[in-house]
């Protein structure tokens, strides 16, 4: 049995149509263990592509050495050289370029808009619950609870600015101290990094692309988690963030100024407000224990209202509640008093889709969640395709060199810091770290930006989002100015501290190594990416939340053994890799544990069993849609089903399941990984529902 599926008798004489590029380079031993166990001999590695029927099929030659999967791919320039084009061709090429740019900007616009709508959808689905998290009085005494509330609320509302503004309102209203607010801000920082991780999941189709994209997204997660791991205990012990920010706030005599500039929102708001508009004050009101807010809808109905202060007769339970004794009376049934009542008159309804539907928040939220995820996914696919077609040959080389090359010696170390500044600046322009890091993710995936360069850009993004918060704080009204500024500064110094911990010395750039590790695992077992997302952003925070509610004794009772086991495993892992000889023979590897405790292979088999039935219909559907899409646009290879579907076909053919001969619009590319580079023993278990 061959290690990759062969194309049967698709063509009677393939040599007429195919130019082979073979290399006799042996597969390295460490990789060969991943390939099919029945055939690990030296294999001529061939990559071939069936080109459109109107052209002579030629094989694109590629370097075939089994290199570092983290090396950026060489994006081939398959087009005709500029010098070889005639005048008409050159004009056409220019127009194509402009067209692609317009399309790219269009899809980028809808990508950003869909992120905004996604945030609104999450707020509609989980906003009220998120608000109730804040109304828990234990936050005051338990920083760990504050942290997980920050994570959960930000994950539920998909917006760190929403959770931060709730915290600011609560601090301003003395419902929360700055000390209690700091862990929540740290949690919000973690929660905001879920957005680009979700975006990375959209690139699950191509294994190598997904490896890079997922690692590039999770580098943000790991930076935030590690920063909190170190800085939360430091803050609890020393209160350095609280003290430093208090000194800064007290040393300035601030006057609240202009509103923080809305830059990207100026372009996106006109579109997103046609889809849905939310009354975000409702979440804050719930957080501040306002019972009436629990029955209010988050969907804004009236956009133009007239607020008038009027004296009104209102009933009071007793004379003690009167505004003044002489302004109280009874009609014989109730006690009445005169109060200044703010009367809101509705003038004009909002102009969005859901204004007249009167659907419950949950229904609107679910509808928007599905739509925004579909648009997000569609835009991402199109952005990747357009970038893929643009970033070829010379253009790719120039861009890659510009972005990823360091300054000449001895200033190479400055490059990263410039990237931090660029990240901060870009985030300030788009006014959202989620938008910036989410836009970065596909670029990492397709190999335009290395993870090493994406890391400082992401760190800069973290700084950028706090500068926006500081500006917003300076523009806030007098009663909230101090608290909002102090909280914004806490956020700023927390990120600065994190950068000082995990960036200046290359050795300390742990988030990169951790993200790459996770990228490798997720590329091999794609279900693990979703598993990671659920565990880190939902299960762990919810578990800690539950244990915290049960009280300190329970939290410590469960937490200490768990932390002890984690430390033990980490120490053992470190010794196994650095100096295994100091360990007894049995502890030099993890084989003493059951397989399911140190390998994902058994879990993969289980998950494949569950997701298997959904794969074939899904891939079938994809092929049909793809064919229709290609027929409509008249391009024979504009659309290609995900690698996942091809892996599935290959796995079946390897087991003797006949696979149809390629048709006109099929674009079958057999890559190194299909030949065993990152293949599990049973290719059937490789492809999951993802």
């Amino acid at each position: 049995m061959a290690p990759w599926p062969e194309l049967g008798d698709a063509q009677p004489n393939p040599s007429k149509y195919l130019e082979g590029a073979t290399s006799q380079q042996p597969i390295t031993p460490d990789k060969s263990k991943e390939t099919n166990k029945t055939d690990n001999t030296e294999v001529p590695v061939t990559k071939f592509e069936l080109l459109p029927t109107y052209s002579t099929a030629t094989l694109i030659e590629e370097p075939t050495e089994v290199d570092d999967p983290w090396n950026l791919p060489t994006l081939q320039d398959s087009g005709i050289k500029w010098s070889e084009r005639d005048a008409k061709g050159k004009i056409l090429c220019v127009f194509q370029g402009i067209g692609r740019l317009i399309l790219l900007l269009g899809f980028l616009y809808f990508f950003v808009c869909s992120l905004d709508v996604l945030s609104s959808a999450f707020q509609l689905v989980g906003g009220k619950m998120a608000g109730q998290f804040f109304s828990n009085s234990s936050i005051m005494s338990n920083p760990l609870l504050g942290l997980v509330i920050g994570v959960l609320v930000t994950v539920f509302v998909q917006s760190s600015s929403t959770s931060t503004s709730i915290v600011v309102s609560m601090v301003a209203s003395s419902l929360l101290t700055v000390r209690a607010a700091i862990p929540i801000i740290m949690g919000a920082n973690i929660g905001t990094s879920i957005t680009n991780t979700i975006v990375a999941l959209m690139q699950v189709g191509d294994r190598s692309e997904f490896r890079r994209a997922f690692a590039g997204a999770t580098v943000h997660d790991f930076f935030n988690w590690l920063s909190v791991l170190v800085l939360l205990p430091v803050e609890v012990a020393t209160h350095y963030l609280e003290v430093v920010t208090q000194l800064i706030v007290e040393s300035f005599h601030f006057k609240n100024g202009e509103d923080a500039p809305d830059l990207l929102k100026v372009i996106t708001k006109p579109f997103t407000k046609l889809i849905v508009q939310l009354d975000k004050k409702v979440i804050s009101q719930i957080a501040m224990n306002d019972e009436t807010a629990k029955n209010k809808s988050l969907v804004k109905i009236w956009c133009k209202t007239f607020t008038n202060m009027t004296q009104m007769n209102v009933t009071v339970p007793s004379m003690a509640n009167c505004t003044s004794h002489s302004l109280c009376w009874t009609d014989g049934i109730q006690i009445w008093t005169m109060k200044n009542v703010t009367y809101k008159e509705n003038i004009a309804k909002c102009q969005h889709i859901f204004v007249n539907f009167h659907l419950p928040d949950l229904a609107v939220g679910i509808i928007l969640l599905i739509i925004s995820l579909l648009v997000l996914c569609g835009c991402l696919i199109m952005i990747v395709k357009i970038l893929g077609s643009v970033l070829k040959g010379q253009v790719a080389t120039v861009i890659k060199k510009t972005i990823n090359t360091d300054f000449p010696f001895p200033f190479a170390w400055l490059t990263g810091y410039l990237a931090i500044l660029v990240g901060a600046g870009m985030t300030f322009i788009v006014q959202s770290s989620s938008v910036f890091t989410s836009a970065l993710t596909p670029l990492i995936g397709i190999g335009v930006i290395t993870i090493e360069r994406a890391y400082p850009l992401t760190l800069g993004s973290n700084i950028g989002t706090t500068t926006t918060a500081i500006l917003a704080a300076l523009a806030s009204p007098g009663n909230t100015l101090r608290s909002s500024l102090q909280i914004a500064l806490c956020h700023f110094f927390f990120n600065i501290s994190g950068i000082l911990l995990w960036y200046p010395i290359p050795f300390t750039r742990l988030p990169i190594r951790m993200a790459k590790g996770l990228g490798n695992i997720s590329a091999k077992y794609r279900w693990f990416a979703v598993f990671y997302l659920i565990i880190f952003f939902f299960l762990i925070p919810l578990t800690v939340f539950g244990l915290s509610l049960a009280g300190w004794p329970v939290l410590v009772g469960v937490g200490v053994p768990v932390v002890f086991i984690i430390i033990l495993v980490l120490c053992l892992r470190l010794l196994q890799s650095r100096c295994p000889r100091v360990l007894p023979k049995k502890l030099q590897n993890w084989n003493f544990l059951p397989l399911c405790m140190h390998s994902l292979k058994p879990w993969d088999a289980v998950i494949s069993k569950f997701t298997g039935p959904f794969q074939m219909p899904c891939c079938c559907c994809c092929r049909v849609c793809c064919r229709v899409c290609c027929l409509l646009c008249g391009c024979p290879k504009c659309c290609r089903c995900s690698k996942c579907c091809q892996d599935l076909e290959e796995g079946q053919e390897a087991q003797g399941v006949p696979v149809k001969a390629p048709e006109t619009f099929d674009n079958i590319t057999i890559s190194r990984e299909a030949q065993g580079e990152v293949r599990a023993p049973d290719s059937k278990t490789e492809c999951t529902a993802l």
């Epitope: 004379m319 002489s326 009376w329 009874t330």
Partner: antibody, heavy 121, light 107 residues
Framework: QVQLQQPGAEVVKPGASVKMSCKAS????????IHWVKQAPGQGLEWIGA????????SYSQRFKGKAKLTADKSSSTAYMQLNSLTSEDSVVYYC??????????????WGQGTLVTVSA | DIVLTQSPVTLSVTPGDRVSLSCRAS??????LYWYQQKSHESPRLLIK???QSMSGIPSRFSGSGSGTDFTLSISRVETEDFGMYFC?????????FGAGTKLELK
């Protein structure tokens, strides 16, 4: 013009209950509160309670809780007061009076003629 | 409950006299005080509302004054039809309460 009509007298046995009426006319019955006031012969006035026919809300003076029950029939524009467990001390005059709109201070611009309740075996 | 104390209990006057009837509240009631006149075998009649506002159809010789805790009903020239009982009532605090009354009689 506004009128409140009450039966002149009611004779009841001790321990029994009486339900006296107050028929309103000349205004919108549901818009004004009806109050009931007790007056012993040669004595002062004592407020018993009030009812707002618009929504049926009632309020009773502490002394008359459980003793008096106020109701109103919108269709006949009539207010009723039922007094339970009557004793000789309840042999007094009971007035109905029209108060103001719901939420306006209580003063009584119009009074019924009063019903004299006589409790005797 | 707010207690209204009326004084004097009985006032004997001759027609043409000027009289002042007093009503004192146990606590401040603003201007939520009303004066009623009740003749023998008749229902009470509202004379003054909100301590000083005369009701329509009430002779101009009746006037009210005061606020807070001390209130006065004045009759500038007593006429024979003015004899009877005079009650004050408050609606500042629940429940509504009446004063015990002042009897205006012929001397």
């Amino acid at each position: 013009q506004v009128q409140l009509q009450q039966p002149g007298a009611e004779v009841v046995k001790p321990g029994a209950s009486v339900k006296m009426s107050c028929k309103a006319s000349g205004y919108t019955f549901t818009s004004y509160i009806i109050h009931w006031v007790k007056q012993a012969p040669g004595q002062g006035l004592e407020w018993i309670g009030a009812i707002y026919p618009g929504n049926g809300d009632t309020s009773y003076s502490q002394r008359f809780k459980g003793k008096a029950k106020l109701t109103a029939d919108k269709s006949s524009s009539t207010a009723y007061m039922q007094l339970n467990s009557l004793t000789s001390e309840d042999s007094v005059v009971y007035y109905c009076a029209r108060g103001n709109n719901y939420g306006s201070p209580a003063w009584f611009g119009y009074w019924g003629q009063g019903t004299l309740v006589t409790v005797s075996a | 409950d707010i207690v209204l104390t009326q004084s004097p209990v009985t006032l004997s006057v001759t027609p043409g006299d000027r009289v002042s009837l007093s009503c004192r509240a146990s606590q401040s009631i603003g201007n939520f005080l009303y004066w009623y006149q009740q003749k023998s075998h008749e229902s009470p009649r509202l004379l003054i509302k909100y301590a000083s506002q005369s009701m329509s159809g009430i002779p101009s010789r009746f006037s009210g004054s005061g606020s807070g805790t001390d209130f006065t009903l004045s009759i500038s020239r007593v006429e024979t039809e003015d004899f009877g009982m005079y009650f004050c009532q408050q609606s500042n605090s629940w429940p509504v309460t009446f004063g015990a009354g002042t009897k205006l009689e012929l001397k």
